[in-house]
């Protein structure tokens, strides 16, 4: 059987000679050099070589466990005379024994962290990491202990596991904000002769809130003149903040003073100035100076610096405001007055009235700009604004008279004002219904009493509150032995219906109806149309086969029945079947 | 179906003031013009007062002018007739009507009678 | 004031034929058309005729209509006891924008 032991070498040997591993042999050996000892596997021949009559193994090469740390080979004894193993192969392990020849390496160059200022001490602030490539298992040399060389007293290190933390109260980033800490990892359990490795670790400070806005003046003062319409900016206040970002961002408001319902203040955002604004019109003439008190806070606080007080401050604003001479003011911005169409000439319609806003109340005149009424139906009384129609009036021409009223002091015509005026025409039934279009129908010679053949419709340029209702008849002077009847249809439409049975158009060709359309308002208007009606010879299908010519010129042809339209190319047969006319042969 | 119905008559002294009012029903009230028409006991009928669609235009009788005011609330189908000023000869029953058919008056109140005694 | 004339009163047989007159002027029957009211007694008028001639549905052809210059006439055919009340004619005024109504003519059922 063999005889050997687990084999152990030693790394990095800087020996002259070879570097002797040990020996493999067999008890079957009797020394006489008749056994021969042959290596194979891991670096056999190479890393590995056997005296293959004694058995002594040597290596040749340096080696490096943190290479290969173990090398497996396999053993054969042989019997030289007869070449056959006089023991089985076997399989045996060189193991490379560590030495401490690496130091530990950070997992990065340089480390960046942050952590908020103002921290409590201890504060987790970033892990840094070395890893050292020594045998972990065999001694200290891969033991990496952490320490602070540079950082102090900022900063503190645990020495197990590289946890950087902060070490000092108030560290404050108004006073410093970058910090270059340099940690060291060193093996050996940190002891002498220990190699080591260093990191940077760059450490910023964040803000917090901890510091107020201040003005940096308890009082400003601006100037505005009193026309300054409403959004227009009079000012710029800006309170400091030692924080950034939204630590920084400052709200303003004004919490107190005599203006606070005539001033606006507004952040700008970009800069993080107060800007004063004009809320209300101002006047001059009832109020010169407003002294407002303006706030600038915080909107982002942090409960636990409220102890170091207040997060806002004050300031006094003072606003002089600056005399203007103004133009006359209405009393409203624009009037809105209604009159009947039917008003006579000289109509008072309504009245307008302006005054100088100023001290000195300097009279006005009125007048109306021409350009608006270029028809002059309106005029004014430039005295006392009393607006009176010129000129009659129709709503049914035009329904809003838009004007134009200017107010011009007396004593200094530049100063004008301008006021619109939309006046309402109201409707009067003052227009008669009449036909909606021209009729012209026709009646076959062989037509059938109470036979419908036109439906009339009529318009009315009035406009009623609900719409029109209309009235038809056949005139009076018409309506006695008429050979037609209107049927009033209740619904705005009225029917013609034959009155007997058959027609001769050689004894009368054409039938001129007189209708009386009436509307059902007040006053009553009424009006008189005519209706053409046609007598045609047709053939049993109610298809026309003679008539005058007349009867054929209007382009829109004939039509009969619900007020349809056809085309003056539409066979009449079409148009007595699509009514359902019944006829007699 | 359309229906008038007036309210508001009663005994009133000389010089005295009464309300009518007329609800109208069943028909688009504020397409037509109404009118109020009145018959003193014994009497044929007098027409009294005109007012149109809108309430833009009204008229009186000679009898009341002045004293008597037609006005109408279209938002409440409903027609009015202000009497001040009353009179002996002003006792009658007074009907709203609905003029229509070129002025015909289709449609009757069932009348409500005023009295003008001391 | 009454502007329209019309006889006080008819009468007539039943089965009778009677007439009704109504006398106007130029500004109310001469331009405008005629209507006519049937009251029975205790009741509101009822319109009768309108359009001078026309009868609303309801009514029978009975009563008829008709207009001439400035007068008016209202004929019943057939009379009838149910027929016995006042009738009244009436027309818009085209001069003054009012309505006029005559005094009414009551009319009489015999037997």
């Known amino acids: 059987s063999w005889m050997w032991n687990q084999f152990f070498l030693l790394e990095e040997y800087t020996g002259s000679d070879y570097q002797y591993v040990g020996k493999l042999h067999s008890d079957q050996d009797r020394g006489d050099g008749s056994l021969k000892y042959i290596l194979s596997g891991d670096g056999a021949g190479d890393l590995f070589i056997i005296n293959e009559n004694t058995g002594d193994i040597q290596a040749t090469k340096r080696l490096d466990r943190e290479e290969k740390p173990v090398y497996i080979l396999r053993a054969q004894a042989i019997n030289r005379r007869t070449g056959r193993p006089v023991e089985p192969e076997s399989e045996f392990i060189i193991k490379i024994h560590d030495i401490n020849d690496n130091e530990p390496i950070f997992t990065k160059d340089v480390y960046t962290a942050t952590v908020p200022e103002m921290a409590d001490v201890g504060t987790f602030v970033v892990q840094v990491t070395a890893t050292d490539a020594d045998d972990p298992t065999y001694g200290n040399s891969a033991k990496v202990v952490y320490s602070i060389l540079q950082g102090q007293p900022y900063f503190s290190v645990e020495s197990e596991t590289g946890i950087i933390k902060t070490a000092l109260l108030n560290m404050d980033r108004e006073n410093r904000e970058q910090y270059q800490v340099v940690i060291q990892a060193k093996d050996m359990g940190g002891q002498m002769g220990g190699l080591s490795g260093t990191t940077t670790v760059n450490i910023t400070l964040t803000d917090v809130n901890d510091n107020p806005p201040r003005f940096p003046q308890s009082t400003y003062q601006f100037k505005t003149p009193e026309s300054s319409p409403p959004g227009t900016p009079i000012g710029r206040i800006k309170a400091s903040d030692a924080d950034v970002g939204e630590n920084a961002e400052i709200e303003y408001s004004i919490t107190d003073g005599e203006g606070h319902d005539m001033f606006d203040v507004i952040t700008d955002q970009e800069t993080q100035e107060g800007i004063i604004t004009v809320k209300k019109l101002l006047d001059f003439e009832k109020k010169r100076v407003y002294t407002l008190k303006v706030e600038a806070s915080n909107p982002h606080i942090e409960p636990r610096f409220l102890y170091l007080g207040p997060f806002k401050d004050s300031a006094t604003v003072r606003i002089v405001v600056d005399d203007v001479d103004e133009p006359p003011v209405f009393s409203k911005l624009a009037y809105i007055l209604q009159i009947r169409e039917d008003a006579q000439i000289n109509t008072t319609i309504g009245s307008v009235a302006a005054q100088d806003p100023d001290a000195a109340r300097n009279p006005v005149k009125y007048s109306v700009d021409r350009h608006t009424d270029m028809d002059r139906i309106f005029n004014i009384d430039s005295g006392n604004g009393s607006i009176f129609t010129s000129k009659l009036l129709d709503r049914e021409t035009l329904l809003w008279h838009n004007i134009t009223v200017i107010a011009t002091e007396i004593n200094n015509p530049k100063q004008s004002s301008r006021v619109p005026l939309y006046i309402k025409v109201l409707d009067v039934n003052d227009n008669a219904p009449e036909f909606a279009e021209f009729y012209e129908t026709f009646v076959c010679e062989k037509a059938k009493a109470d036979q419908l053949i036109q439906t009339l419709h009529a318009v009315d340029k009035d406009d009623p509150y609900s719409g029109h209702q209309f009235s038809f008849s056949l005139a009076p002077e018409a309506a006695s032995g008429s050979n037609f009847t209107i049927q009033d249809n209740k619904d705005n439409t009225a029917g013609i219906l034959t009155r007997k049975n058959g027609y001769n158009r050689h004894e009368m060709s054409t039938y001129l109806l007189p209708v009386v359309i009436s509307d059902n308002d007040y006053p009553v208007q009424s009006s008189t149309g005519t209706v053409t009606v046609r007598v045609c010879a047709c053939d049993h299908h109610g298809n026309m086969q003679s008539c005058h010519a007349e009867a054929l010129i209007h382009p829109t042809g004939l039509s009969t029945g619900a007020g349809s339209e056809f085309r003056h190319d539409s066979g009449l047969n079409d148009i007595f079947e699509a009514q359902k006319i019944e006829w007699h042969e | 179906q359309v229906q008038l119905l007036e309210s508001g008559g009663g005994l009133v002294q000389p010089g005295g003031s009464l309300r009518l009012s007329c609800a109208a029903s069943?028909?688009?009230?504020?397409?037509?013009?109404m009118n109020w028409v009145r018959q003193a006991p014994g009497k044929g009928l007098e027409w009294v007062s005109v007012?149109?669609?809108?309430?833009?235009?009204?008229n009186y009788a000679d009898s009341v002018k002045g004293r008597f005011t037609i006005s109408r609330d279209n938002s409440k189908n409903t027609l009015y007739l202000q009497m001040n000023s009353l009179r002996a000869e002003d006792t009658a029953v007074y009907y709203c009507?609905?003029?229509?058919?070129?002025?015909?008056?289709?449609?009757w109140g069932q009348g409500t009678l005023v009295t003008v005694s001391s | 004031d009454i502007v329209l004339t019309q006889p006080p009163s008819v009468s007539g047989a039943p089965g009778q034929r009677v007439t009704i007159s109504c006398s106007g002027s130029?500004?109310?029957?001469?331009?405008?058309?005629v209507s006519w009211y049937q009251q029975l007694p205790g009741t509101a008028p009822k319109l009768l005729i309108y359009?001078?001639?026309n009868r609303p549905s309801g009514v029978p052809d009975r009563f008829s209509g008709s207009k001439s210059g400035t007068s008016a006439s209202l004929a019943i055919t057939g009379l009838q006891a149910e027929d016995e009340a006042d009738y009244y004619c009436?027309?818009?005024?085209?001069?003054?924008?009012?309505?006029?109504f005559g005094g009414g003519t009551k009319l009489t059922v015999l037997g």
């Open positions: 009507a609905r003029p229509s058919y070129f002025q015909a008056m289709d449609y």
């Open positions: 069943g028909f688009t009230f504020s397409s037509f013009a």
């Open positions: 007012i149109s669609s809108s309430g833009s235009n009204t």
């Open positions: 130029s500004s109310n029957i001469g331009s405008n058309f």
């Open positions: 359009d001078n001639s």
């Open positions: 009436s027309s818009y005024d085209s001069f003054d924008h009012s309505w006029v």
